[in-house]
């Protein structure tokens, strides 16, 4: 048993049929010695008396808020949560496996630049009685500070019969140098509590590996005289690290017909313009990627040809 | 500790070209190592990230773009002094800091070159003959060093009398390639910045 936060404790349980329960001794936080009684949750029934209450925690029915009282007055609370371990593996019932980039990916993180700011998100089908708490650091043995905000519900989607909820959190490394060469990964730890179930999820990464630039901005077409060709121009996204001559991007320009089946013409360039043939009803899209370290491509920025 | 914005100089172009080749070569070599050594811990998640140049050179700090010198998190490093002549420099126009930056890059390359050559000698003794260093990568390191053209003491190649542990050598190769790739990215960024300045 360990303390998650004040008056909230996590009991780690081996979750197999013939596992014994965990013996837990609850102590009432009071100088009083006599006349103390214990109740659980909303029930007013007395579960025991005395300054300590020894319980066996085996089921979710044994978890909950234990309260000690004296003469109708509440003295203290202890909320017990359960963390299940099945076949030596901690349960992952609360979050959905996103399976990208590999199986058992519950947390996904992205950074728009090298400033040390990043966003992580996760999915669940649970809509109520759900809380998240996020901590992060650079390295684990001698951790350096990363500050994370509160996790918030960022999207709701319907998937078949199920509703899916996306939560996200923004974090910022306390003292980040965009030009630094990372040798210690960022560690992100999410505590998830659903009703009386506790789970924790972790992700470890280098900022350089989760970079995904914003799409190029100000995408414009300039027709070339007496030609079907157009000059496409764009700019670096505002969110990209500066100076751009140091943090350079490379670009992919794509001409795509109305039909998804039509052949796509693609051009790669380090410049912020390109000359392409604009077909009728086609659209021109441009996306960006770090020129020197191949992490993710940005989403496409698009304009119609006509 | 910063790179001044100078007028463009054609003398920078050869270094930019060589640094691009270097990044391409080390990335290819790392990819090959990952594939060939698929049953070894060779991915970024599996290896320990070690920097053989740590406390010996200060490339990131010495080559910091001017715009980032206002960022205190980028300035917590030590001073290192280097020899200041090199053919990538437009001699009179180049500041002391740029010289320091380029000589730091040169020292990095020299250290990696020695390590890679020593390692290759060991890998050539492996009866499995599983993996060797790409000669192209070694050549590209050499070319960039020549383009930088710093006078520097030659570092003798390390020789070892004991029987090599090939498993450890291959893991060390992965660690070295990952670190060198990260340094090659920094070198490429620096050359691009200097080229645009």
């Amino acid at each position: 048993i360990w303390e998650l936060k004040k008056d909230v404790y996590v009991v780690e349980l081996d979750w197999y049929p013939d596992a014994p329960g965990e013996m837990v001794v609850l102590t009432c936080d009071t100088p009083e010695e006599d006349g103390i009684t214990w109740t659980l949750d909303q029930s007013s029934e007395v579960l025991g008396s005395g300054k300590t209450l020894t319980i066996q925690v085996k089921e979710f029915g044994d978890a909950g808020q234990y309260t000690c009282h004296k003469g109708g007055e509440v003295l203290s609370h202890s909320l017990l949560l359960l963390h299940k371990k099945e076949d030596g593996i901690w349960s992952t019932d609360i979050l959905k496996d996103q399976k990208e980039p590999k199986n058992k990916t519950f947390l996904r993180c992205e950074a728009k630049n090298y400033s040390g700011r990043f966003t992580c998100w996760w999915l669940t089908t649970i809509s109520t009685d759900l809380t998240f708490s996020v901590k992060s650091s650079r390295g684990s043995s001698d951790p350096q500070g990363v500050t994370c905000g509160a996790a918030t519900l960022s999207a709701e989607r319907v998937r078949g019969d199920n509703k899916e909820y996306e939560y996200s959190v923004e974090c910022q490394e306390d003292s980040a140098c965009p030009a630094a060469e990372e040798s210690l990964p960022i560690e992100v730890m999410v505590d998830a509590v659903h009703k009386l179930k506790y789970e924790n999820y972790t992700s470890s990464f280098f900022i350089r590996d989760i970079i995904k630039p914003d799409p190029p901005k100000n995408l414009q077409l300039k027709p070339l005289k007496n030609s079907r060709q157009v000059e496409v121009s764009w700019e670096y996204p505002d969110t990209w690290s500066t100076p751009h001559s140091y943090f350079s991007l490379t670009f992919c320009v794509q001409v795509q017909g109305k039909s998804k089946r039509e052949k796509k013409d693609r051009v790669f360039t380090d410049k912020t313009s390109a000359t392409v043939i604009c077909r009728k009803n086609a659209s021109i899209s441009v996306r960006a990627q770090d020129r020197y370290y191949s992490s993710s491509w940005s989403e496409w920025a698009s304009v119609p040809c006509s | 500790r910063n790179l001044p914005v100078a007028t463009p100089d054609p003398g920078m172009f050869p270094c930019l070209h060589h640094s691009q080749n270097l990044l391409r070569a080390v990335s290819n070599m790392l990819q090959k190592a990952r594939q060939t050594l698929e049953f070894y811990p060779c991915t970024s998640e599996e290896i320990d990230h070690e920097d053989i140049t740590k406390d010996k050179t200060s490339t990131v700090e010495a080559c910091l773009p001017l715009e980032l010198t206002k960022n205190e998190s980028c300035l917590n490093s030590r001073e290192t002094s280097f020899i200041t002549n090199g053919s990538c420099l437009a001699s009179r126009k180049t500041s002391f800091m740029m010289a320091l930056c380029l000589s730091s890059i040169y020292e990095d390359l020299k250290m990696y070159q020695v390590e890679f050559k020593t390692m290759n000698a060991k890998l050539l003794m492996d009866p499995k003959r599983q993996i060797f260093l790409d000669q192209n990568m070694l050549a590209v390191i050499d070319e960039l060093m020549q383009a930088l053209n710093f006078n520097s003491e030659t570092v003798p190649q390390k020789s070892s009398l004991e029987e090599p542990d090939f498993y450890k050598t291959k893991i060390k190769l992965c660690i070295l390639l990952h670190a060198f790739r990260i340094r090659a990215v920094t070198i490429d960024r620096v050359m691009s910045y200097l080229n645009a300045s």
Partner: antibody, heavy 119, light 107 residues
Framework: EVQLVQSGAEVKKPGESLKISCQSS????????IGWVRQMPGQGLEWIGI????????RYNPMFRGQVTMSVDKSSSTAYLQWSSLKASDTAMYYC????????????WGQGTMVTVSS | EIVLTQSPATLSASPGERATISCRAS??????LAWYQQKPGQAPRSLIY???NLQSGIPARFSGSGSGTDFTLTISSLEPEDFAVYYC?????????FGQGTRLEIK
């Protein structure tokens, strides 16, 4: 006052289905799991299983798994035990009981439902 | 599963006497053992939990002791209403199991 009131005695033929009930009152129904115990004529007590009234989480005795089904209706504070196809060997007194949280034993019992299966 | 063996199977005693019933487990159940009393035609009633804790409303003449594999239920001075069948139950490991019962009868 805590009370567990069970449905009346049943006489059934082999192969028939049956659902007996246990209605709780006088306490916070969702705080306490409900269990079932079998007592064959002239025999001792046998633990069938327990279930959570919150999310219908169930722990069956392997000996009874597939033979009986436990269920619960939170809105009426009622627990059920059912059979899809009765056998003569199911003849017994069935007790529902309230599981004490933080312990696991049964602190309050229903009066029992006698189930007789005979052709 | 854990087997609980009660002894004796039948205990003959007179009102006012001390009665002791034993319950032995096939493996340790820590202190997670309960005792129940069942009278003819009635449902069982909880007497003792966690080996030695008296259930609310049960007379103090009933007491329990033991831990691990050996447990004892003691009735310090028998009253006429105490003659019944007594069962021990372990609730440490699933499936929870009962002893076969001890019949306490009037001598």
């Amino acid at each position: 006052e805590v009370q567990l009131v069970q449905s009346g005695a049943e006489v059934k033929k082999p192969g028939e289905s049956l659902k007996i009930s246990c209605q709780s009152s006088g306490y916070s129904f969702t705080t306490y799991w409900i269990g079932w115990v079998r007592q064959m004529p002239g025999q001792g007590l046998e633990w069938i299983g327990i279930m959570s009234p919150v999310d219908s989480d169930i722990r069956y005795n392997p000996m009874f798994r597939g033979q009986v089904t436990m269920s619960v209706d939170k809105s009426s504070s009622t627990a059920y035990l059912q059979w899809s196809s009765l056998k003569a060997s199911d003849t017994a007194m069935y007790y529902c009981a309230r599981r004490r949280p933080g312990q696991g034993y049964f602190d309050f019992w229903g009066q029992g439902t006698m189930v007789t299966v005979s052709s | 599963e854990i087997v609980l063996t009660q002894s004796p199977a039948t205990l003959s005693a007179s009102p006012g006497e001390r009665a002791t019933i034993s319950c032995r487990a096939s493996q340790s159940v820590s202190s997670w053992l309960a005792w129940y009393q069942q009278k003819p035609g009635q449902a069982p009633r909880s007497l003792i939990y966690a080996a030695s804790n008296l259930q609310s409303g049960i007379p103090a003449r009933f007491s329990g002791s033991g831990s691990g594999t050996d447990f004892t239920l003691t009735i310090s001075s028998l009253e006429p209403e105490d003659f019944a069948v007594y069962y021990c139950q372990q609730y440490n490991i699933y499936p929870f199991t009962f002893g076969q019962g001890t019949r306490l009868e009037i001598k």
